[in-house]
Interface confidence: low
């Protein structure tokens, strides 16, 4: 009869953590008679995984009925795999003997790799908005991966960031690992459309890294600039005063007109125009009837943006000037809302 060979047809098996690994082993002959044992590792320090003849191995089941004399399939399944199970498994045929069976021939070994994918990275930014030129911190977390080796990169609009700190926990052996990274980002006025990306590369992802993103639109506040201008209107004794609110983000904005310190009208930004950089512009106007006033009028455009302290810009209407040229006083016609397209 042909010499017995112990065939482990799979050089390697890749199993996800928590699943069952099937390790295949067959013999080419029924003789010599004797049991099979499975070991992890080779040499004197090898670890017994399964003994056909004796012992209790609750995580191990055999593929075939090893009690049948004509069985030549010594494959096993190991349940609930963890990364600690990684290693090379040898199927070893023993020659029956007394008092001990004698090792006869070993299979070539099957390398079991246990891999768990990292979870999708979650990127979180600061709790409160910040203005340009400020530095804000973003965190990125991903969990449940194995092996421990992992690469994390940060990008802002495709440009790699360098100011970040990363930790992989735990430091020692574990079933799975987590990564936590904090990156510092300096905001600019152009960052409304910007994105911060955390990219995680791991052996389980086969060169296709996972990405988590955060939009800086959730983080940035660009305060508005104000400009108050006066324009004559065709009608006698009327002056149109406009307040240009430029380059602000987010849209949440309330504008109040004051005449000599007294509230004349309050309105909320609604129909805004969007700039290419994602910021907004808005304009409010006030139609002023100057004929009823002898004294100069101080008009103030006061803007409260995104819950921040109000900013304002004032404009003096000179009553002495000819109405058609400059306009003068302010029995302001507070008639309704801002109709932007009046001129």
């Amino acid at each position: 009869e042909e010499e017995l060979q112990v065939i482990q047809p799979d050089k390697s098996v890749l199993v996800a953590a928590g699943e069952t690994a099937t390790l295949r082993c067959t013999a080419t002959s029924l003789i010599p008679v004797g049991p099979i044992q499975w070991f992890r590792g080779a040499g004197p320090g090898r670890e017994l995984i399964y003994n056909q003849k004796e012992g209790h191995f609750p995580r191990v089941t055999t593929v075939s009925d090893l009690t049948k004399r004509n069985n030549m399939d010594f494959s096993i399944r190991i349940g609930n795999i963890t990364p600690a199970d990684a290693g090379t498994y040898y199927c070893v045929k023993f020659r029956k003997g007394s008092p001990d069976d004698v090792e006869f021939k070993s299979g070539a070994g099957t390398e079991l790799s246990v891999r768990a994918k990292p979870s999708a990275p979650v990127v979180s930014g600061p709790a409160a908005r910040a203005t340009p030129q400020h530095t804000v911190s973003f965190t990125c977390e991903s969990h449940g991966f194995s092996p421990r080796d992992i690469t994390l990169k940060w990008f802002k609009n495709g440009n790699e960031l360098s100011d970040f700190q990363t930790n992989v926990d735990p430091v020692g052996e574990s079933v799975s690992y987590s990564i936590h990274s904090t990156a510092k980002v300096v905001l600019t006025r152009e960052d409304v459309h910007s994105q911060v990306i955390c990219e995680v590369a791991h052996v389980t992802l086969q060169g296709d890294p996972l990405r988590g993103t955060a939009n800086l639109s959730e983080t940035i506040r660009v305060p508005p600039t104000l400009e108050v201008t006066q324009q004559p209107v065709r009608a006698e004794n009327q002056v149109n005063v406009t307040c240009q609110v430029r380059k602000f983000y987010p849209q949440r904005l309330q504008l109040t007109w004051l005449e000599n310190g007294n509230v004349s009208r309050t309105e909320t930004a609604s129909t805004v125009t969007e700039n290419k950089d994602g910021t907004y512009n808005w304009m409010s106007w006030l139609l002023v009837n100057v004929s009823a006033h002898r004294d100069d009028v101080k008009l103030t455009c006061q803007v409260e943006h995104d819950g921040q302290p109000a900013v304002s810009k004032s404009h003096d209407l000179k009553v002495s000037a000819h109405p058609k040229e400059q306009g003068s006083n302010t029995a302001a016609e507070n008639t309704g809302s801002n109709e932007r397209n009046i001129y």
């Epitope: 699943e19 067959t26 080419t28």
Partner: antibody, heavy 120, light 107 residues
């Protein structure tokens, strides 16, 4: 090129046995698993088992363990499947299949199939 | 053993159409799924293995996708030679088991 040659037809009586062959050529016979598949008339494919010619190692689906015996003859690069205690339920086309992917459970090359008729 | 459930059992379509056949495994088989085509009176032919890899010589109008327990085979722009029976088969064995098949007929 890889080829698997099977006899076109076998006719046997109920209760008898049949040993059908699958002759391989065009590749290293002992390096790749050979799988056997059953297809009853108008029905789907049913995996019976496979054998590793390099070792004679076999796998069977449970329902065929007592029905089908898989063997190989490496000297003639031929795989055999013996079906025992035949009944009309065993009337079917039997395919052998192999290929470079056979270790990984897919089969690139198929024989033409042997039509087995069990009839008295 | 892992059971494979294929749907639909039968499908009629016209030349030029796009069709999708699905296959469900009774347990996680990762990406270890193959697809075969079989024409009347002929042997099966491998189309796709490991869920999405096209076998040699298979036209690019065929594409496989899926992982875990849910898989599909998509055929774009059906050609007359595409009509026949299609089978999925899990590779996560042995034993390996086939789906019950999908018959693709000309409308």
């Amino acid at each position: 090129q890889v080829q698997l040659q099977q006899p076109g037809a076998e006719r046997v009586k109920p209760g008898a046995s049949v040993k059908m062959s699958c002759k391989a050529s065009g590749y290293t016979f002992t390096s790749y698993w050979i799988t056997w598949v059953k297809q009853r008339p108008g029905q789907g494919l049913e995996w019976i088992g496979d054998i590793y010619p390099g070792s004679g190692s076999t796998n069977h689906i449970e329902k065929f363990k007592s029905k089908a015996t898989l063997t190989v003859d490496t000297s003639s690069n031929t795989a055999y499947m013996q079906l025992s205690r035949l009944t009309s339920e065993d009337s079917a086309v039997y395919y052998c299949a192999t290929g470079y992917g056979s270790s990984y459970g897919y089969f690139d090359y198929w024989g033409q199939g042997t039509t087995l008729t069990v009839s008295s | 053993d892992i059971q494979m459930t294929q749907s639909p059992a039968s499908l009629s379509a016209s030349v030029g159409e796009t069709v999708t056949i699905t296959c469900r495994a009774s347990e996680n088989i990762y990406s270890y799924l193959a697809w075969y085509q079989q024409k009347q009176g002929k042997s099966p032919q491998l189309l796709v293995y490991t869920a999405k890899t096209l076998a040699e010589g298979v036209p690019s109008r065929f594409s496989g996708s899926g992982s875990g327990t849910q898989f599909s085979l998509k055929i774009n722009s059906l050609q007359p030679e595409d009509f026949g029976n299609y089978y999925c088969q899990h590779q996560y064995g042995p034993p390996f088991t086939f789906g019950s098949g999908t018959r693709l007929v000309i409308k």
